[in-house]
Amino acid sequence: MAEPRQEFEVMEDHAGTYGLGDRKDQGGYTMHQDQEGDTDAGLKESPLQTPTEDGSEEPGSETSDAKSTPTAEDVTAPLVDEGAPGKQAAAQPHTEIPEGTTAEEAGIGDTPSLEDEAAGHVTQEPESGKVVQEGFLREPGPPGLSHQLMSGMPGAPLLPEGPREATRQPSGTGPEDTEGGRHAPELLKHQLLGDLHQEGPPLKGAGGKERPGSKEEVDEDRDVDESSPQDSPPSKASPAQDGRPPQTAAREATSIPGFPAEGAIPLPVDFLSKVSTEIPASEPDGPSVGRAKGQDAPLEFTFHVEITPNVQKEQAHSEEHLGRAAFPGAPGEGPEARGPSLGEDTKEADLPEPSEKQPAAAPRGKPVSRVPQLKARMVSKSKDGTGSDDKKAKTSTRSSAKTLKNRPCLSPKHPTPGSSDPLIQPSSPAVCPEPPSSPKYVSSVTSRTGSSGAKEMKLKGADGKTKIATPRGAAPPGQKGQANATRIPAKTPPAPKTPPSSGEPPKSGDRSGYSSPGSPGTPGSRSRTPSLPTPPTREPKKVAVVRTPPKSPSSAKSRLQTAPVPMPDLKNVKSKIGSTENLKHQPGGGKVQIINKKLDLSNVQSKCGSKDNIKHVPGGGSVQIVYKPVDLSKVTSKCGSLGNIHHKPGGGQVEVKSEKLDFKDRVQSKIGSLDNITHVPGGGNKKIETHKLTFRENAKAKTDHGAEIVYKSPVVSGDTSPRHLSNVSSTGSIDMVDSPQLATLADEVSASLAKQGL
């Protein structure tokens, strides 16, 4: 196990992840169906899940829920035991994801719904679907930090990025992001790289000259497409691309992010702000390592929980993503990419073993809280019983955790097929993505197979049932590795399930007489809304008991039944981490104090608006960021970064009123404006029509149940399609434009072409 004590980093940037326009599962959790990933993970495998619409067409993307983002609360509430402030994990600074970072790399991409994760997480409390990331478990930072930490992860449930990660989506498979959040720049890259640069003959330059073909397609997102439920049209579980069984969900899981931390206390959103400003966080440098490919055997995770009392919490996250390396998550698994997305091929290659975690100095002025640290070593055993490479070696050693930092970028660049694109195929070589600031861990070890996944589309006869016309060789959709684990049944929108091609793809002229009942779209049955797996009811603040035996039936099934988890010292642990005994660590009696310090926003770079304009209203539940004509062109932080949103505990709605949003092309707003955001066919009106930026994704305060920042722009832009800034999804496609939900098709095209270097 990578260090036994891996602190699961809070993905600062989860924000985008949950709720990035992905389906929102119950509880407001955005279900990002890993299309593939989930399936692989045994997460929801909704065959043919209808992708959520970008929403680009319709604000409420077809999947009505698709875009709704989980409420902050939903995201943060999970498992965090509010009771033990002392336990609160030190807030991890809200790390900004580098502009170039793909959403996936950044971990911003859609993340599996909490539910999914919840269901499958090992040892999760049945109800708390969320596993507190160990990072959360980290030594308590200032009280309330946990919450905020959570907040720091926009939308990130406590659960590590989910199961899908755990399950490691097959490369290229991903839940539908519905065009989500790659950063505009990234989008451009991808787009550029992708479409045109893709294989086609290089497009000629205006001059008619052919542009050099792209070097290599960077399929950065491929690995991770986290969100599209639709990915697999048919339910047929197709093996993960890696061929990993869904079980491999434990991404090398050195540490199981999902390991519930009982004592974790949700931190107030403000915390994040504070933390982000106050607490330096070391961002994991290393790319996330996907599991080594080929590890098909499900890993058994044995959690060794060591509770070391009075361990000085390391503020720095040098270890940060130790587990990361361990997690087999698909490299860069999409939004959840653990680290920078490694190229598909890069699935964890020989990543150097990170040095042991070094305690990071606590931020100055912050006393190091000594709180027993629950160290969970997750010993992942492959079916063969051996731990993953990482796991094997690390099962017991704490220090062995690999630190991804400095991990060489292993992602092999996918050789670019000869530029076949008619368009230029400038392809950017796959570069090691920067490690996302907050890699997301997939916590759910056990992949749950959604009931939907269980459903097999029955072939419909010519009697009028849905037929899947499958080109030869085309494997029926939905062939995704299905996890054995029982997944929470998800409603699966009828997905066309092409019968698994039995060796021979249907011949193209042949009617693939496959009609599969259940095929999506059986007349009237087809619903674009991705089926929302019914998440187990989660109580927002349950402390995930580290107990191995899953308590809730569903969770039990979904969880890998860890062999008796050797919890060496647990017998000495008298109280649950969140138990009151631990509260003593917090003088406050476990009260999480959300101190809304007025952050010096001057330092906060928020794309949402100038920091200066953000006025924190302590008592006002609504923070209104009044935008004077703000020149966002230079703003680099994500709109919605928690640091920028001062969530008032009571705050309900954050309204960002922009008098004039001067989105310059330069604005690299992760929130969905591509650099090209100015490209509004409407003539350049840069004003965004009142769009609600649902910062639920980003606003994490528990109290903020999805505070929505209303982006009110006095001037209605002529753009017929307002940019859905909230739709930040990581799309690996070159045609990434989806992600930002550029205001117009032209923007998307431009972004895509820009990516391609066209």
């Epitope: 326009g21 169906q33 992708p51 959520t52 680009s56 067409e57 077809e62 991409g109 859609d110 290229g172 839940p175 539908e176 992001d177 519905t178 065009e179 989500g180 991808h190 992708g194 479409d195 045109l196 893709q198 294989e199 086609g200 397609e217 399929d219 997102d221 491929r222 497409d225 986290e226 599209s228 439920p229 639709q230 990915d231 999409g334 996918h414 097929p417 694109d421 008619p422 368009l423 092309d665 090209n676 100015t678 066919p681 409407g682 003539g683 399609s721 799309t731 690996g732 496609s733 070159i734 045609d735 990434m736 989806d738 117009t744 098709l745 032209a746 095209v749 431009s750 895509s752 072409l753």
Partner: antibody, heavy 115, light 112 residues
Framework: QVQLQQPGAELVRPGASVILSCKAS????????IHWVKQRPGRVLEWIGR????????RYNENFKSKATLTVDKPSSTAYMQLSSLTSEDSAVYFC????????WGQGTTLTVSS | DIVITQDELSNPVTSGESVSISCRSS???????????LNWFLQRPGQSPQLLIY???TRASGVSDRFSVSGSGTDFTLEISRVQAEDVGVYYC?????????FGGGTKLEIK
Amino acid sequence: QVQLQQPGAELVRPGASVILSCKASGYTFTNSWIHWVKQRPGRVLEWIGRIDPNSGGTRYNENFKSKATLTVDKPSSTAYMQLSSLTSEDSAVYFCSRGVLHDYWGQGTTLTVSS
Amino acid sequence: DIVITQDELSNPVTSGESVSISCRSSKSLLYKDGKTYLNWFLQRPGQSPQLLIYLMSTRASGVSDRFSVSGSGTDFTLEISRVQAEDVGVYYCQQLVEYPYTFGGGTKLEIK
């Protein structure tokens, strides 16, 4: 080389649903959108919608939202379009094309809706 | 939706001659970024459309330089010089400024 393979024809009864497939090869499937375009005999091309294979995000022509559902299966690099409640009006050639610019097109699947 | 209108060429052209195919948009396709979001496709008989020109003036790979586009804003002309037999087919212009993508009705080019 980039190729989008589509079945040549589909015969379906009215009221039924059909799933047309488009298998992509020669490029990274998740890097480019897959569009679906309808062409009725009159030569007119109608854009139905597009899906981002990477994210599953979709965009539909309002005229087809209730008719088509786009999905993808990444593992097989195949895009699917389900057409429901078929009527004779849906009889047409359906093409899938790649990328924002529709730089590559499949050969099209001729869908015949007939009782 | 943006409506794209194309004239049908009813008169066959002689090989070697030049021909102009017009395309009109109900809305300017010149985007604020200075690019004109207009594509041209050729659909040869029995085949699927193929991209000829994108963003109004850039030829797709492999496309002959005999094809050029002129015009701006809402009126465009695809000019094919020295028409050849292989140029026969239906030419479609497509706007990429706003969703939904819309295509013109197509102009059929025939050679005498």
